[in-house]
Interface confidence: low
């Protein structure tokens, strides 16, 4: 879309009166402490708010919490603390909200020192009523719901027991001791690691990986010498210690741990780590840390089995284990990911891929921006996006990049325009085409959110001073209106809107401070009268995603197909509505070499689409471990990219021969696994 207008412009008629009639204030009868907010269910309008306040006394800390409930998207709240017997709720466990629209809520209470176990409050009617339950253990983690059945809960105890409930927390059973980490898999399966010699830390690299498919009646050991494990898409990953030294390697299973294959990834040493950046049912992005305290590593993308990996991006910024990475899945357009690299001069630059990691490029410079002081050439520079790393470095970045699957093409992020990320105060940029082009949307840092599937964008300036103004745009951030939502400014703490970006309500949270006291306050604004009518067919326009060259017959082809979307015209001021479904028309593309990744032992030279044999492997038989057997690979170097739907065109041939020999390097071969029943 054309740039040209960056500041406010007259657009929506009589919006002040319309918004004033739909602005709802709620002052919470609370001393300021911390506040947490959760939506219960989808499109139910139910919000739970937990406020907690700690009073440090001489010998101990006295805590008080209050629970509030709204059933109209935050316009009105009712104090329901009495439903939980005025008990102090532990905020570190948050509010455990059940999956989908189960209406289930679990709150974990603080209990006095000598008690036998913890206490929870359970609701299965969207927090209208709660049942108090005393636990036979002290929880170490929040209750975890099975994704398939919200009556099934698991939790770890402070004594490392794995506890399971089959009746939504009414009755609990310890199914295993000495457990370090537990996760739900598919079909109510639980995966967990156990230690033998005293503690999780002491046994790191000597843990066992277990599986139960019947909630603890029977178990199977599916891995030994385990350092850690993770689930991503349909893949189960384990990092496994090598026999001879302190290195470890990734093994992968696609059958819940029955059989394992060694991933063709570099091994890592004690100080290094692996990290699953993103995974779906087709493939996985894996980060492999560089040796030494470099702060970077390499991104690899997998084949459809999670075994063969292609190098995707070098010098990928990722600080120490559990540290920060800017890797972001742009959910508003298929195949798009954004992340940061650490360049040789230690500056940080943003990179984007439009084809699921096949190629990475810099972000195009916004047309309405100048290159900043980081740019060597004032006419040539890129947009660099602030994400988790910038936030961790306490730069003036209040929010990470934002995209929503139902707001097609829209990406909003803080950024700077130059040769690298700048420490100067950032501005907010928007892309309406999934990251191909960008426009400066707002000057200076802001909080932002998307409403009505992109029909409205709301923003609030990030300021240390109290605020009373909200900005909104009905044309994807081109033009902005400002609305004063209260006469008395508040210290702003957060914007809250229902997850999924379908709502037309936004809640502004903050606190008022007077000489004597400070109180939590929320303002909920409903934009329904700004978007007065429902959108009609004429309000939408056809948009070809990933279009870069309209003259090219294959324009828009990514991963073997192109998609045309019906998108709301920027000029249309109307409601997409809560039932809005993204309308897209896919069409299959002809295969080209771009639709194939390089097979094991092959690589793509820069700026070349052909896969060539790795020099060090030339003339050698390509052998690798698959399901615990050694495989002999006969290949011309190509393998179809996972999820690629192309047909016809070029079709490289590939063949795998089974050598029927055992893999000595596979620590997770089937005969090392055993089963037992309780």
């Amino acid at each position: 879309s054309a740039p040209g207008e960056d500041e406010e412009c007259g657009r929506v008629r009589d919006f002040v009166a319309k918004l004033a009639n739909n602005t709802h204030q709620h002052v919470f009868d609370d001393l300021r402490g911390s506040v947490s907010l959760s939506w219960v269910g989808d499109s139910t309008g139910v919000i739970l708010v937990l406020t907690t306040f700690h009073v440090p006394l001489v010998i101990m800390t006295f805590g008080q919490s209050k629970l509030y409930r709204s059933e109209d998207y935050g316009k009105n709240f009712k104090d329901i603390t009495d439903l939980i017997n005025n008990t102090f709720i532990r905020t570190e466990f948050g509010m455990a909200i059940g999956p989908e629209n189960s209406g289930k809520v679990v709150l974990t209470a603080e209990v006095s020192g000598g008690s036998r176990g913890g206490r929870i409050f359970r609701s299965s009617d969207f927090a209208k009523n709660f049942v108090q339950t005393d636990l036979p253990f002290h929880p170490l983690t929040q209750m975890m719901y099975s994704p398939q059945n919200s009556d099934y809960l698991l939790a770890l105890s402070t004594e490392n027991g794995l506890w399971v409930s089959k009746n939504f927390g009414g009755k609990w059973e310890e199914i295993h001791k000495a457990v370090c980490l537990a996760k739900w898999g598919s079909d109510n399966t639980i995966f967990f690691t156990t230690y033998a010699n005293g503690s999780c830390k002491a046994d790191l690299g000597a843990l066992e990986l277990w599986r139960t498919s019947d909630l603890g009646k029977s178990f199977k050991t599916i891995g030994v010498k385990i350092y850690s494990f993770g689930l991503g898409g349909r893949f189960l990953f384990a990092s496994v210690m090598a026999d001879k030294d302190t290195t470890r390697r990734i093994h992968v299973s696609t059958d819940q741990g029955d059989t394992w294959s060694m991933a063709q990834l570099p091994s890592v040493g004690q100080e290094q780590f692996y990290s699953i950046l993103a995974a779906n049912d087709d493939m996985v992005f894996m980060h492999v840390d560089e040796p030494g305290d470099t702060g970077f590593g390499t991104i690899f993308t997998s084949d459809d089995r999670g075994i063969v990996y292609s190098k995707s991006l070098d010098r990928h910024l990722y600080t120490t284990t559990g540290g920060e990475t800017d890797f972001t899945n742009v959910t508003s357009l298929r195949g798009v990911y954004i992340t940061s690299v650490l360049s040789e001069d230690n500056s940080i630059q943003t990179m984007i891929t439009f084809d699921q990691g096949g190629r990475w490029t810099h972000l195009r410079k916004p047309e309405n921006s100048e290159c900043d002081a980081t740019a060597k050439n004032k006419n040539e520079c890129s947009l660099h996006i602030h994400a988790s790393y910038s936030i961790s470095q306490k730069l003036n970045v209040p929010m990470a990049p934002l995209s929503e699957p139902n707001a097609v093409g829209i990406v909003i992020a803080h950024g700077s325009v130059g040769d690298a990320i700048s420490v100067m105060v950032p501005d907010v940029y928007i892309s309406d085409d999934g990251g191909y082009s960008w426009t400066k949307m707002l000057e200076g840092p802001h909080y932002y959110t998307i409403l009505d599937s992109g029909g409205i964008i709301v923003a609030i300036e990030h300021s240390s001073r109290p605020i009373n103004v909200i900005k909104f745009s009905t044309d994807e951030g081109q033009c902005w209106q400002t609305y004063t939502f209260t006469r008395d400014p508040i210290y702003f703490t957060g914007l809250a809107s229902e997850p999924g970006a379908r709502s037309m309500n936004i809640s502004i949270w903050g606190f008022t401070e007077s000489f004597l006291t400070s109180q939590w306050v929320s303002y909920t604004i409903d934009f329904k009268d700004i978007l007065e009518r429902n959108c009609e067919e004429k309000d939408y326009t056809i948009w070809l995603a990933h279009s870069t060259d309209p003259e090219d017959y294959e324009d828009g082809c990514i991963l073997g197909y192109k998609e045309q979307f019906l998108r709301l015209r920027k000029s249309s001021v109307c409601q997409n509505g809560r039932d809005y479904v993204v309308t897209k028309q896919p069409s299959i593309c002809l295969c080209s070499l771009e639709d194939f990744l390089c097979d094991f032992g092959y690589y793509r030279p820069e700026n070349d689409s052909k896969c060539v044999e790795q020099p060090e492997l030339k003339g050698h038989d390509l052998e690798f471990c698959l399901y615990g057997r050694e495989e002999h690979l006969t290949t011309n170097g190509y393998r179809k990219i996972p999820g690629d739907k192309c047909q016809g065109g070029v079709n490289p041939v590939r063949e795998v021969k089974d050598l029927k020999k055992k893999c000595t390097s596979n620590f997770l071969s089937p005969e090392k696994q055993n089963s037992k029943s309780n």
Epitope: E7, G10, T541, R569
Partner: antibody, heavy 118, light 107 residues
Framework: EVQLVESGGDLVKPGGSLKLSCAAP????????MSWVRQTPDKRLEWVAI????????YYSDTVKGRFTISRDNAKNTLYLQMSSLKSEDTAMYYC???????????WGTGTTVTVSS | DILMTQSPSSMSVSLGDTVSITCHAS??????IGWLQQKPGKSFKGLIY???NLKDGVPSRFSGSGSGADFSLTISSLESEDFADYFC?????????FGGGTKLEIK
């Protein structure tokens, strides 16, 4: 009523300079982007330059880049076009145009004539 | 630059007729096109924006269609005040470019 009134057009020698103004009463000038567009004697239209509502951003056509400068004074509700190193091909009727939130040629002025001739 | 090819350059029509003017963009511009009217000796008036949207106050006998690279302006049941010059303009990317114009004359 929204109206735009251009002034400053004149006969000028090649290489000379001229400054055009566009007065913009009748609407909140500071919230709109503004453009200059010219119409040559053969009636062809050519977009010249655009400036954002706050004046932070300007864009030019390649034919005038480096010679013309678009600016605005929001306090005076006035848009300007400073033209220098004028050429005979700059001879045209110059119009200012308002960029609304919908699109970029929403309201037009009445025009002012610039003739570059020796 | 995007070249906007407008046709016809002129046409003679009668009152009450329906006419269509077309504009072809040298590359896809989605629906970032507007249509303008210029009466003899006068300035310009915006008629249509984003390809199909009628500007407030413009009679409903004017309509726009098309998207991508081919667009048209249709005027149904012509009235005397409609005899004027018409121009298309693309604002998909800088520099904004105009069609050569169509002169509508009374037959």
């Amino acid at each position: 009523e929204v109206q735009l009134v251009e002034s400053g057009g004149d006969l000028v020698k090649p290489g000379g300079s001229l400054k055009l103004s566009c007065a913009a009463p009748g609407f909140t000038f500071s919230t709109y982007g503004m453009s200059w567009v010219r119409q040559t004697p053969d009636k062809r239209l050519e977009w010249v330059a655009i400036i954002s509502s706050g004046g932070s951003y300007t864009y030019y056509s390649d034919t005038v880049k480096g010679r013309f400068t678009i600016s605005r004074d929001n306090a005076k509700n006035t848009l300007y076009l400073q033209m220098s190193s004028l050429k005979s091909e700059d001879t045209a009727m110059y119009y200012c145009s308002r960029s609304s939130s919908h699109w970029y040629f929403d309201v037009w002025g009445t025009g002012t004539t610039v003739t570059v001739s020796s | 630059d995007i070249l906007m090819t407008q046709s016809p350059s002129s046409m003679s029509v009668s009152l009450g007729d329906t006419v269509s003017i077309t504009c072809h963009a040298s590359q896809g511009i989605s629906s970032n096109i507007g249509w303008l009217q210029q009466k003899p000796g006068k300035s310009f008036k915006g008629l249509i924006y984003h390809g199909t949207n009628l500007k407030d106050g413009v009679p409903s006998r004017f309509s726009g269609s098309g998207s991508g690279a081919d667009f048209s302006l249709t005027i149904s049941s012509l009235e005397s005040e409609d005899f004027a010059d018409y121009f298309c303009v693309q604002y998909a990317q800088f520099p904004y470019t105009f069609g050569g114009g169509t002169k509508l004359e009374i037959k």
